[in-house]
């Protein structure tokens, strides 16, 4: 049975086996086409999600689709039902929390009272000014909190207590990529992890440990990527994995927060990377133990210089490393998080590509997660 499962796939009606390599090859080899059903699926960028959260205390903003203008949500008459609607618009299914925060002097968007129409937030027609003088601070999910704070050093062994959202993504029980837990159903990783194997069956996720292979595997229901853009072949290196059963959160299994839409990180901002990847470029082996390292944002202009990536780093990517080189992600770290700590930990990047590992002029290149928030929300909404 194990050998059959490894090399063959069972078609139904009539029952017969086909070689597993014929799964997800674009050809209907089973009469009912089920060999092309459980494959990596692409999902378009989709329409603009009309709500978003700002780095200014996670305050809620709402889009006026008629004008294309964004407005901050006033706390006047804001309710739990409205909070739930806002979070559902972003694809969250958990119970949100919200509070009033005072409007600051640098508030630049106008502030409006919010109402609901057809399960979407709307600006209240002819609402008065914001009498409370407060905005809505909204949290759709408790995220980005770990039991232990890492020490700031170069590279060291990591504890799952520090990074409870880190997962190992495995094919046929072999570690292929890292990933991050975003909520009980969803894991964030890189699309290029699935280039070789596009069938969902043999992919598994392992969560809750810092040692490879020492923790139970979780079945995957769906793997979703963005449609390929031939104009920018390295763009869109992002994937969402939907788990067959929701995770139960604990001290060692917790979600990381998505970044805010306006999370602009300036050069030299400290960040963290983690993974079980190669410890040496072009050699060595996967690390059995999770490793962590502190890096920093590297200016995109510097990263695109003639002695570096020569313009290949697009607006939807970011660079991180240390100016002198030597600390970087490598093969096997792909898909893992590039993390920023404010009040909580946020996954601002996904380990994507680079030339070599740890070179001074060619730091790691990461998918900029804030550029894909709309896509993430649209995927989640479609799967609610």
């Amino acid at each position: 049975k194990v050998i059959l499962d490894k090399y063959y796939f069972l078609c139904g009606q009539p029952l017969h086996f086909i070689p597993r390599k014929q799964l997800c090859d674009g050809e209907l080899d089973c009469p009912l086409g089920e060999d092309e059903e459980h494959c990596v699926k692409s999902f378009p960028e989709g329409p603009a999600v009309a709500v978003r959260l700002s780095k200014d205390r996670s305050t809620l903003q709402v889009l006026d689709s008629a004008t294309g203008n964004w407005f901050s949500a006033c706390f006047d008459n804001f309710t739990e039902a409205l909070a739930e609607t806002a979070c559902r618009q972003m694809g969250y299914s958990s119970k949100p929390t919200f509070r009033a925060v005072e409007i600051g002097p640098d508030q630049d968007l106008d502030v409006v009272e919010i109402t609901e129409n057809s399960q979407e937030l709307r600006m209240r027609n002819s609402s008065g000014p914001c009498l409370s003088g407060s905005l809505v601070s909204l949290h759709c999910l408790a995220c980005g909190k770990s039991l232990k704070t890492p020490r700031v050093v170069g590279v060291e062994e990591a504890s799952v207590d520090s990074w409870p959202w880190q997962v190992s993504i495995q094919y046929d029980k072999q570690h292929v990529c890292g990933g991050s837990i975003l909520d009980p159903h969803w894991v964030l990783t890189a699309a290029h992890c699935f280039r070789k194997h596009t069938d969902v069956f043999n992919w598994k996720v392992r969560a809750g440990s810092d040692k490879l292979g020492s923790f139970p595997s979780l079945a995957v229901a769906k793997i979703i990527i963005i449609e390929f853009n031939p104009m920018y072949p390295k763009d869109n290196d992002i994937a969402l994995m939907k788990l067959q059963f929701p995770l139960t959160f604990s001290g060692t299994v917790r979600p990381i927060c998505l970044p805010f839409f306006d999370e602009e990180l300036t050069p030299a901002t400290p960040l963290w990377i983690i993974g079980w990847g190669f410890t040496k470029q072009n050699g060595g082996k996967m690390s059995d133990i999770l490793l962590q390292a502190s890096v920093q944002v590297i200016d995109s202009t510097r990263c695109n210089a003639d002695d570096a990536y020569q313009g290949e780093v697009t607006e939807k990517m970011m660079c991180a490393g240390i100016p002198e080189g030597g600390v970087d992600t490598c093969q096997g770290d792909s898909g893992g998080p590039l993390m920023y700590q404010s009040d909580q930990w946020h996954v601002v990047g996904i380990v994507s590509w680079g030339y070599g590992c740890g070179g001074p002029s060619t730091p790691g290149v990461y998918t900029k997660v804030s550029a894909y928030l709309n896509w993430i929300y649209n995927v989640w909404k479609a799967e609610l």
Epitope: C74, I103, G104, P105, D106, Q107, D110, V111, V112, S126, S127, G128, P129, C130, L131, G133
Partner: antibody
Framework: QVQLVQSGAEVKKPGASVKVSCKAS????????MHWVRQAPGQGLEWMGI????????SYAQKFQGRVTMTRDTSTSTVYMELSSLRSEDTAVYYC?????????????WGQGTLVTVSS | DIQMTQSPSSLSASVGDRVTITCRAS??????LAWYQQKPGKAPKLLIY???SLQSGVPSRFSGSGSGTDFTLTISSLQPEDFATYYC?????????FGQGTRLEIK
Amino acid sequence: QVQLVQSGAEVKKPGASVKVSCKASGYTFTTYYMHWVRQAPGQGLEWMGIINPSGGSTSYAQKFQGRVTMTRDTSTSTVYMELSSLRSEDTAVYYCARGRSWYRSNVDYWGQGTLVTVSS
Amino acid sequence: DIQMTQSPSSLSASVGDRVTITCRASQSISSWLAWYQQKPGKAPKLLIYAASSLQSGVPSRFSGSGSGTDFTLTISSLQPEDFATYYCQQSYSTPRTFGQGTRLEIK
């Protein structure tokens, strides 16, 4: 675009009242506060008070309390400022000015001003 | 009431000069401060809000700084159209109060 158009110049006798209007357009009238500010000839700016065009509530500077009344008409998107018991030192240009959509916000748009001359 | 004191009351400068005007509040107003420019016979125009945020459409040679009680407006390189009177205003509490103004003249 946002526009605040004020009524024309007035000449009044001491002890009389004046009512200046300010018609707003180009934005949702009820969402933004309206301030009144005056400027005597060759002098600086002096804040008189604020009105919430949605509910009609007001707050006046102590100096004008009892003499000033600010009202609004939402059907015509117009605010009014009436100043009574006029004296010669009330001769000034009176401006309406739009506040943003929260109380502590600054003023971002101004009317063109209405000159009120108080003279016997 | 919060008193706003501007200095200097007037100053003469030349095109291309860097000019700084200061505004002091009688108590802390956090960053609830705006700067306005007024030309003769015209209504004031908002330049800076929240002490340092540039209003849309205002040239970048204008900048503001400060918080608490001490604030400055800086014009990095004076242009002919910048000769006017400048006012600061606090919006921290009612009544909103203005500074007495700074008249900027051509030297």
